[in-house]
Interface confidence: low
């Protein structure tokens, strides 16, 4: 169904005749028969199977014709019609005088005829107008043509039918070509399935208007991608639903047994390093200067040794004092008041005067320090190694003795603890600063995951229709997930299809 | 946005030809007649001619007729106006200008071309 | 073909008076008649179509009225941009498309 539009546009009779070359009088009052038919490959008369149309007069002689023309008459001219367009086309527009003011062709002298034109041709369906001029001896006519579909008629031919809709039969607009083109937030082939909140989970979420999402069970959050896990589950997480994956330093089927009370307690005092030792069992390594269980308890500052070059120590209330042997002063006995003629230094460290010989500096030969040569220089003093490595003084040299897990020189390389595969029964190894982590399968448990804790309800395969199944260790029972389109507790049951269309 | 692009100048001598083109965008090129106009130096709007794009009729000013060729091509929405056995007096600028014909303002001309000049000089 | 007569061939006015400009037809245009604006090296700008009809974007200062023969371009309050050459065109008769032989509106 559509309508075949012609645009008048100008008429051009300067001499004011009619066809048969006779003057009209006292001008060509003219109006326009359009006649449009199947494509002939020449035009002849006959019925105009597509259609007829007549304007009212338009003017006079010569005349444009503007659109919606006054006087009844309308431009452009509108020839619809009610089968499928055929893409070709045969058009005639006559122009005829009218002595008077009835229209009607047998009110008319058969000699009024001022011109006649006629076209054929392929004409597509479309917005745009086809612009024309047809001159005859003493006429010429301007005018434009196209064909455009009526309302929710579409394609080529204006053969496909679609009528906009928003309800439950679907959500959607039309496009030129007849194609439905979905409202927001909706999609599928009649745009009936919603569009669900953005990131919604594909599997685990779904929903039932446009932007919102529904979690299916076992699955929560705003985006249904937060598992939930076994109830009852303290200190641990999931990857799957009904899982408890304990988080680092809790045991337990349930997360709640405390094996790092260091981290969840700090009870080390006065900076001390904190061991884990076992379930809620701690060792505190003290600072100088403390002790007891917890570093507690300050230690005499005398307990460190401030005093050098033998001097001895004496606690003070807010403090101590160094008492110096003779030839030395200072507040740690650190300076000297020798001088290089009471050969000072030693290990072959030579003397030199200073402040007119009051006091003398050693120079120390390689591997010895001290203010006089005393001491053997230690390499591990900077402490080299990394990863909590020993340093160990090797003559000339030294070297790193690593840990597990290190090497290289200096300790600073990561050997990865989980190329030897240490979890058991299909666990997820992962690499931490201090060792390795499993992450066990449903039904096992244990640092290695080598503790079986429940029977695997999915062992047999309980879910119909591709549904992953996943197994409640809090009853030993499973869980059915249903893909889109089935339900029931094995997802055996498909969903009622969606009701046929009325077009 | 209807865009009319004209040619550069133009410096010929007299008895050769020139060919100023018109490239339009902005709009469905075929449904548009356009014209051409030239203005002397100093002198008022002269119009030369129309062609429809769509099937390439021309109507040219009685001055100007076989001396004037106006062609087009649709594939890349352009017009062009070829004036031949030029003289001193075609010294002008020359303009495409849009015919408004899909609206009210029918066959006045609401978009132009920004003008070429061509220069005839021996 | 329509002969379009302009006058007067120049008109010297101040910014802010009212400027007035005729245009006359050889033969009845009916209102088929146009007026433009051009100012030096820019193409021509349509104001006024079909006689009294403002286009898109024209300020409301410049009005056209007539018909038939004799035409006239209204400026009420003169812009210092208006000062330029005015153009009357008519499509009543064609081909020719004619113009006016233009009017400048100067600066007094």
């Known amino acids: 169904s559509g309508v075949f539009q012609l645009q008048l546009q100008e008429f051009i009779n300067e001499r004011g005749v009619l066809a048969s070359g006779r003057p009209c009088e006292p001008g060509c009052r003219t109006f326009f028969r359009v006649c449009l038919k199947h494509f002939q490959a020449v035009v002849s008369p006959g019925p105009c199977t597509f259609g007829t149309v007549s304007t009212p007069v338009l003017g006079t002689n010569s005349f444009a014709v503007r659109d919606d023309s006054s006087g009844g008459g309308r431009n452009p001219l509108q020839l619809p019609f009610n089968f499928t367009w055929p893409g070709t086309f045969s058009l005639i527009i006559e122009a005829w005088h009218a002595p008077g003011d009835d229209l009607r062709p047998e009110a008319l002298p058969p000699d009024a005829l001022i011109s006649k034109i006629a076209i054929q041709g392929s004409l597509a369906v479309g917005q745009n107008w086809l612009l024309d001029e047809q001159t005859s001896t003493l006429t010429r006519l301007r005018y434009s043509y196209r064909v455009i579909c009526s309302d929710n008629y579409y394609g080529d031919n204006c053969s496909r039918l679609c009528k906009k809709r928003n309800d439950h039969f679907g959500h959607y607009v039309c496009q030129p070509d007849g194609n439905l083109s979905c409202l927001p937030g909706w999609t599928g082939e009649y745009c009936q399935q919603p569009i669900c909140l953005s990131g919604c989970h594909e599997q685990n979420g779904y929903c039932s208007k446009p932007a919102e999402c529904l979690c299916r069970p076992g699955w929560q959050g705003r985006l249904c991608n937060e598992c939930i896990p076994h109830n009852g589950c303290r200190h641990g997480t999931c990857s799957t639903p009904w899982q408890c994956t304990c988080d680092e330093g809790w045991g337990g089927l349930f997360c709640d047994q405390d094996l790092n009370y260091c981290t969840h307690h700090s009870p080390c005092k006065n900076g001390a390093t904190c061991s884990n030792s076992g379930q809620r069992s701690y060792t505190c390594t003290c600072r100088p200067g403390y002790t007891g269980v917890d570093c507690e308890l300050e230690l005499s500052e005398c307990d460190s040794n401030p005093c050098r070059n033998g001097g001895s120590c004496k606690d003070q209330e807010d403090g101590y004092h160094c008492l110096c042997p003779p030839g030395y002063y200072g507040l740690h006995c650190e300076h000297s008041t020798l001088s290089c003629a009471d050969s000072p230094c030693f290990n072959g460290g030579s003397c030199r005067e200073r402040n007119q010989g009051a006091n003398y500096a050693c120079e120390c030969p390689p591997n010895f320090t001290g203010s006089n040569c005393e001491k053997k220089v230690d390499r591990c003093t900077s402490n080299p190694c990394a990863n909590g490595g020993q340093c160990l003084n090797r003559g000339p040299s030294r070297m790193c003795r690593c840990r597990p897990g290190f090497t290289g020189t200096y300790c600073e390389l990561h050997v990865s603890d989980c190329a030897r595969n240490p979890c058991a029964h299909g666990g997820t190894c992962h690499d931490l600063e201090n060792g390795l982590m499993c992450t066990c399968p449903a039904g096992f448990s244990g640092r290695r995951c080598e503790v079986r804790t429940s029977i695997d309800a999915c062992a047999s395969s309980p879910c119909f229709n591709r549904a992953t199944c996943y197994t409640d260790l809090s009853t030993d029972t499973f869980v059915c997930n249903c893909p889109y389109g089935f339900v029931g507790s094995r997802c055996e049951f498909p969903v009622g299809l969606p009701p046929s269309f009325p077009w | 946005q209807v865009q009319l692009v004209q040619s550069g100048a133009e410096v010929k001598k007299p008895g050769a030809s020139v060919k100023v083109s018109c490239k339009a965008s902005g709009y469905t090129f075929t449904s548009y007649y356009m014209h051409w106009v030239r203005q002397a130096p100093g002198q008022g709007l002269e119009w030369m001619g129309i062609?429809?794009?769509?099937?390439?009729?021309?109507s040219y000013a009685q001055k100007f007729q076989g001396r004037v060729t106006m062609t087009r091509d649709t594939s890349t929405s352009t017009v062009y106006m070829e004036l031949s056995s030029l003289r001193s007096e075609d010294t002008a600028v020359y303009y495409c200008?849009?015919?408004?014909?899909?609206?009210?303002?029918?066959?006045?001309?609401?978009?132009w071309g920004q003008g070429t000049l061509v220069t005839v000089s021996s | 073909e329509i002969v379009l007569t302009q006058s007067p061939a120049t008109l010297s006015l101040s910014p802010g008076e009212r400027a007035t400009l005729s245009c006359r037809a050889s033969q009845s245009v009916s209102s088929y008649l146009a007026w433009y604006q051009q100012k030096p090296g820019q193409a021509p700008r349509l104001l006024i179509y079909?006689?009294?009809n403002r286009a898109t974007g024209i300020p409301a200062r410049f009005s056209g009225s007539g018909s038939g023969t004799d035409f006239t371009l209204t400026i009420s309050s003169l812009e210092p941009e208006d000062f330029a050459v005015y153009y009357c065109?008519?499509?009543?008769?064609?081909?020719?498309?004619?113009f006016g032989q233009g009017t400048k509106v100067e600066i007094k």
């Open positions: 062609i429809n794009p769509s099937g390439g009729s021309t």
């Open positions: 079909d006689a009294s």
């Open positions: 065109q008519q499509r009543s008769n064609w081909p020719p498309w004619t």
């Open positions: 200008a849009r015919e408004e014909y899909a609206s009210s303002s029918a066959e006045y001309f609401q978009h």
